[in-house]
Amino acid sequence: VTGSRVYPANEVTLLDSRSVQGELGWIASPLEGGWEEVSIMDEKNTPIRTYQVCNVMEPSQNNWLRTDWITREGAQRVYIEIKFTLRDCNSLPGVMGTCKETFNLYYYESDNDKERFIRENQFVKIDTIAADESFTQVDIGDRIMKLNTEIRDVGPLSKKGFYLAFQDVGACIALVSVRVFYKKCPLTVRNLAQFPDTITGADTSSLVEVRGSCVNNSEEKDVPKMYCGADGEWLVPIGNCLCNAGHEERSGECQACKIGYYKALSTDATCAKCPPHSYSVWEGATSCTCDRGFFRADNDAASMPCTRPPSAPLNLISNVNETSVNLEWSSPQNTGGRQDISYNVVCKKCGAGDPSKCRPCGSGVHYTPQQNGLKTTKVSITDLLAHTNYTFEIWAVNGVSKYNPNPDQSVSVTVTTNQAAPSSIALVQAKEVTRYSVALAWLEPDRPNGVILEYEVKYYEKDQNERSYRIVRTAARNTDIKGLNPLTSYVFHVRARTAAGYGDFSEPLEVTTNTVPSRIIGDGANST
């Protein structure tokens, strides 16, 4: 007659007489004169099917009413809620002695769902039910009715189902509602783990251990477990799940991070707004994409802002000291949003005639404190060549410079080292030897260290051992030494001079003049 009624989530109804459409049609014994199915009107003028008996005149009443078969549905313990009205015997004059104010509740387990008769001896008594003072006042047909509610439980049950029976022993009673239910711990999500509907144990004190499964888009941190208590309440949650990267907990679910938010790891944190200079265009981002021109270093956390390479250093000053240069500069105007700024020095040696033709300086040049990864804004460069054009670039770098090597990041200066005494001449040759002369030629020093103003040739007879020598000066890289004695060994040294002075003499070249008037042409250092 009435639709499904709403009961607590932890109760599963197996029978509800108030929800049965039409007549209940339970079995009564005796068939006549005992329990009778009667419709009464509730507060909404809707008929309620009740069972009534009021045989208060005769002694030794034994009126039975049996429900239809009730499936157990796997429950081991069931609860019977009876709402009933019991008439006070005092309101029925002349029935003292025969009128009772209790009835008895029985059950019988059976696998047979079609037992047609009541066999009283098969039934097991659950309890004697009496009206107590804890009644509820309910409107029935525009008047207040005292409605008693009694709940009993029975178990453990093992067969497929069971029957309930009500034995009247002479009361004036109406069964207004009979509800049979079992308790379960309802499907729930706790600590992001889902625990299924779980039927309570057979015992009123038993706990059923249940393992939970992580909700979608989450993973176990510790094994999630809970215990289902006999009253249908979940107890003692242990362990938990964490939302995967790109997801956060919302309403007991792991939901994707919204656009503009991200979450990098499986943690219990919420999604965070994308850091400065980054964005996410999809839901469920585990990191945010850097804006154009901004980057994230390999070891930068996803939570760090995207950064960019620094701008060029400022105010580069050079100070040349002979073949050393001291450079100083200021930090860049824009560090790119990073703290890990450092500086690299690039040294290029450039031709005097064409400054665009530059080559790396090579390993002979030394840098103090170092060439790369400088943390200070100064460097000293030594062991340069004198009188040479050098271009020095100071590069400002940070953790993301490698992603965008932009020339704007460096500042450069071109200097020329001071002139110095030239290096020694590596190779001196006797080109022509006669009885009285020697024609010499040589190469420019490896390091002229300036403009070669002249070359000086020193020579002496070998046996004089430099006690008496002569000097010849020439601007050319060759000269004829005349007025020599025939058949005599001479030693020749050549050195170059710049404005800064003379360089070292070359290694000695020993040459012996001829005895005959013929010419000998040689290129060795020890012509004879």
Epitope: I40, S91, G94
Partner: antibody, heavy 121, light 106 residues
Framework: QVQLLQSGAEVKKPGASVKVPCKAS????????MSWVRQAPGQGLEWMGW????????TYAQGFTGRFVFSLDTSVSTAYLQISSLKAEDTAVYYC??????????????WGQGTLVTVSS | EIVLTQSPATLSVSPGERATLSCRAS??????PAWYQQKPGQAPRLLIY???TRATGIPDRFSASGSGTDFTLTISRVEPEDFAVYYC????????FGQGTKVEIK
């Protein structure tokens, strides 16, 4: 089928007595109380009282004590109303009616056809 | 003793119309009264008893309601066989009837 059968009309002189039988059939006589109701000509119904058919214990309404007696013979499932010292104002139809007790209230669910008792000199 | 007063004494209705009969108690009663129908020359017939329950064979156009001291019998659509006298009856340690309402054809 449940019925209550009453005797035919009675004409009595003032001061006389009358015993009106009500025979029950179709149910267990001792399981239901029996009530008596009077209806004077052209008047409404008056409840006279009832008798516990199991114990024989009667209950009389105000105004129906003394001259009115309810009795039983359970062996023949019959209830009796005896009126003594009849008066002209006792002229009425007398009904027996089976009482139905319920949790929610009582009523008389089966009625006899009534016995007209006329008191006239 | 509780006195029941019925009104109106006579109610004129046409077949198919709704009829509403009133029964007022001299003091508050805990239960709804029973209602009876009596046609001329016949014994009364129980219509409705405890908690507004219709007696066996009574059509559902008859219904009863009320609480405390004011009670009502309603015939939703009067049929020709419904023209009769109607009595309310209060029960308890002592039972009393109302004086009756006659429902007649308009």
């Amino acid at each position: 089928q449940v019925q209550l059968l009453q005797s035919g009309a009675e004409v009595k002189k003032p001061g006389a007595s009358v015993k009106v039988p009500c025979k029950a059939s179709g149910y267990t006589f001792t399981s239901r109380a029996m009530s008596w109701v009077r209806q004077a000509p052209g008047q409404g119904l008056e409840w006279m009282g009832w008798i516990n058919t199991n114990t024989g214990n009667p209950t009389y309404a105000q105004g129906f004590t003394g001259r009115f007696v309810f009795s039983l013979d359970t062996s023949v499932s019959t209830a009796y109303l005896q009126i003594s010292s009849l008066k002209a104002e006792d002229t009425a139809v007398y009904y027996c009616a089976r009482v139905r007790f319920t949790v929610y209230g009582d009523g008389m669910d089966v009625w006899g056809q009534g016995t007209l008792v006329t008191v006239s000199s | 003793e509780i006195v029941l007063t019925q009104s109106p004494a006579t109610l004129s209705v046409s077949p198919g119309e709704r009829a509403t009969l009133s029964c007022r108690a001299s003091q508050s009663v805990s239960s709804n009264p029973a209602w009876y129908q009596q046609k001329p020359g016949q014994a009364p017939r129980l219509l409705i008893y405890g908690a507004s329950t219709r007696a066996t064979g009574i059509p559902d156009r008859f219904s009863a309601s009320g609480s405390g001291t004011d009670f009502t019998l309603t015939i939703s659509r009067v049929e020709p066989e419904d023209f009769a006298v109607y009595y309310c009856q209060q029960y308890g340690p002592s039972w009393t009837f109302g004086q009756g309402t006659k429902v007649e054809i308009k």
